[in-house]
Interface confidence: low
């Protein structure tokens, strides 16, 4: 059910409180690895290691994306992979910066209709199902860079060209400036900066904090919408329970979002989506007579 839909592998790099930011190179334990007279030491992090077959996956996704999207056919996927790899290979996985990803950002530059952007927080699956049906709207993961990295984990090791498949830094327990977190922070910021007119955001009404200031949306995207371009942020609050007819647009966290947005000189609007299953069905078939009653 909707209660189980979380942001999964789009790692919520900022989800903890700020005291986690003091973590640096010293965290992680050293463990012996390999055989031979000179033991090789590797840092042991708290998070899962790089996704299996990471290089092949990124390359394959890039090829597939550029085949499906004619406007990106000019992209050289080998160069994309080299730039991706260059952002984190041989670098300490707790010392990654947005600058490390700039060559990749440059290669992945893509124009999406700025008035067709759908942001989401902790309800990724439904957001993606929606843009699969409503093909002229885009989530971050519908862009090349978002598509490449969606659901993947990666990190390297300082001073070696190896990819670490054993473990990678966890945002909370190890450090915030890790390769995955910095990547999503960078692309999320750029995506929000590109938005114009009316920007939509899908929020999970089943969560205790429907709007969470510590989510990617709450800490990066909200603050990077450009008031001179964005007229309105419209929140779609997705209900989880079939019989839940409360107006979740009145939730205190939504009021908090409205306050933040209003202070940035952007208008705020909110809609409840009571029946996400019916909502998707009605996006597919708006002519269906049952789609004129509540969704």
């Amino acid at each position: 059910g909707l209660n189980d839909i979380f942001e999964a592998q789009k790692i919520e790099w900022h989800e903890g409180s700020h005291h986690h930011h003091h973590h640096h190179h010293g965290s992680g334990s050293l463990v012996p690895r390999g055989s031979g007279s000179v033991p090789r030491w590797r840092q042991q992090w708290s998070g899962p290691g790089t996704t299996k077959r990471f290089p092949e996956t990124v390359l394959a996704r890039c090829v597939k994306y550029t085949e499906i999207h004619p406007e990106m056919r000019h992209v050289d996927c080998q160069s994309v992979w080299d730039a991706f790899k260059g952002a984190f290979i041989s670098k300490h996985p707790c010392n990654i910066t947005e600058e490390d990803y700039q060559p990749l950002m440059k290669l992945g530059t893509q124009t999406v209709p700025c008035n067709k952007i759908l942001l989401w927080s902790r309800i990724k699956d439904l957001a993606h199902q929606f843009t699969q049906v409503q093909r002229d709207m885009f989530t971050l993961e519908d862009t090349l860079l978002g598509y490449l990295a969606d659901d993947l984990t990666w990190c390297g090791e300082f001073n070696t060209s190896k990819i670490n498949y054993q473990s990678c830094p966890d945002w909370r327990k190890d450090c915030s400036n890790n390769p995955v977190s910095v990547f999503w922070k960078t692309v999320s910021r750029r995506f929000a900066e590109a938005a114009c007119d009316v920007v939509h955001v899908m929020l999970n009404g089943s969560r205790s904090k429907i709007f969470d200031k510590n989510s990617t949306f709450g800490s990066v995207e909200v603050h990077n919408l450009q008031p001179e371009k964005v007229q309105t942020l419209e929140a779609w609050v997705i209900h989880g329970g079939r019989e839940d007819s409360r107006d979740l647009c009145q939730d205190p966290t939504i009021k908090e979002l409205e306050s933040i947005i209003s202070k940035r000189n952007i208008q705020f609007s909110c809609k409840n989506i009571y029946r996400p299953d019916k909502f998707l069905q009605c996006v597919k078939n708006p002519e269906d007579s049952s789609c004129t009653s509540e969704i």
């Epitope: 008035n115 409503q134 002229d136 709207m137 009316v198 939509h200 309105t232 419209e234 779609w236 019989e243 007819s245 107006d247 647009c249 208008q267 609007s269 909110c270 809609k271 409840n272 989506i273 009571y274 909502f279 009605c282 996006v283 708006p286 002519e287 007579s289 049952s290 789609c291 004129t292 009653s293 509540e294 969704i295």
Partner: antibody, heavy 123, light 112 residues
């Protein structure tokens, strides 16, 4: 404050078409349903159909199916209603109306109305 | 289509007195979420219609509290507890449960 401003009165010949516009200002356009409702002289209100711009596909009352086309241009926040094969019975004031709902993502809850456009069909 | 029947057709009222308009639908407007998808509109002379009541009994913003909506399923009532001169106009009920949306024939409220 949401405002809906409609195009001016039209006089048309039977068999021709008319296209009425409805420009929205002062609020979100794309995900709020815009409906078209008409009122013949001295008669009641009649819903013709509507569109949720973000979804693009219109929903029409069976009575007008095939004769009416409702579209929306998100770039100008304008909705259009085109009625073809006009006959004298189509003489009416045509209103656009927008939902103002945090309650349902749908037609109805017409909090905002245009000023109306009189279309006269006469030979 | 859902047929909406209003009565009376005309309602002469005295200012300060209550008034009541009835609306009946050919099928239930009660949705599975517990709400009745019935709305009331008034069209004052020379004006566009305006929303009074939505979801059967909820007053729209800016609507005076002398207006109230009640009923469920197929039978609904709009009450004005003390009519004022500015309340003259034609009152319509409308079902918003399914396509096509349909209006009642209207009730003309006029001052005696």
């Amino acid at each position: 404050q949401v405002q809906l401003v409609q195009s001016g009165a039209e006089v048309k010949k039977p068999g021709s078409s008319v296209k009425v516009s409805c420009k929205a200002s002062g609020g979100t356009f794309s995900s709020y349903a815009i409906s078209w409702v008409r009122q013949a002289p001295g008669q009641g209100l009649e819903w013709m159909g509507g569109i949720i711009p973000i979804f693009g596909t219109a929903n029409y009352a069976q009575k007008f199916q095939g004769r009416v086309t409702i579209t929306a241009d998100e770039s100008t926040s304008t909705a259009y209603m085109e009625l073809s094969s006009l006959r004298s019975e189509d003489t009416a004031v045509y209103y656009c109306a927008r939902d103002s709902s945090s309650w349902y993502f749908t037609y109805g809850y017409f909090q905002h109305w245009g000023q109306g456009t009189l279309v006269t069909v006469s030979s | 289509d859902v047929v909406m029947t209003q009565s009376p057709l005309s309602l002469p009222v005295t200012p300060g007195e209550p008034a009541s308009i009835s609306c009946r639908s050919s099928q239930s407007l009660l949705n599975s979420n517990g709400y009745n998808y019935l709305e009331w509109y008034v069209q004052k002379p020379g004006q566009s219609p305006q929303l009074l009541i939505f979801l059967g009994s909820n007053r729209a913003s800016g609507v005076p509290d002398r207006f109230s909506g009640s009923g469920s399923g197929t039978d609904f009532t709009l009450k004005i507890n003390r009519v004022e001169a500015e309340d003259v106009g034609v009152y319509y009920c409308m079902q918003a449960l399914q396509s096509p949306l349909t209006f009642g024939g209207g009730t003309k409220v006029e001052i005696k």
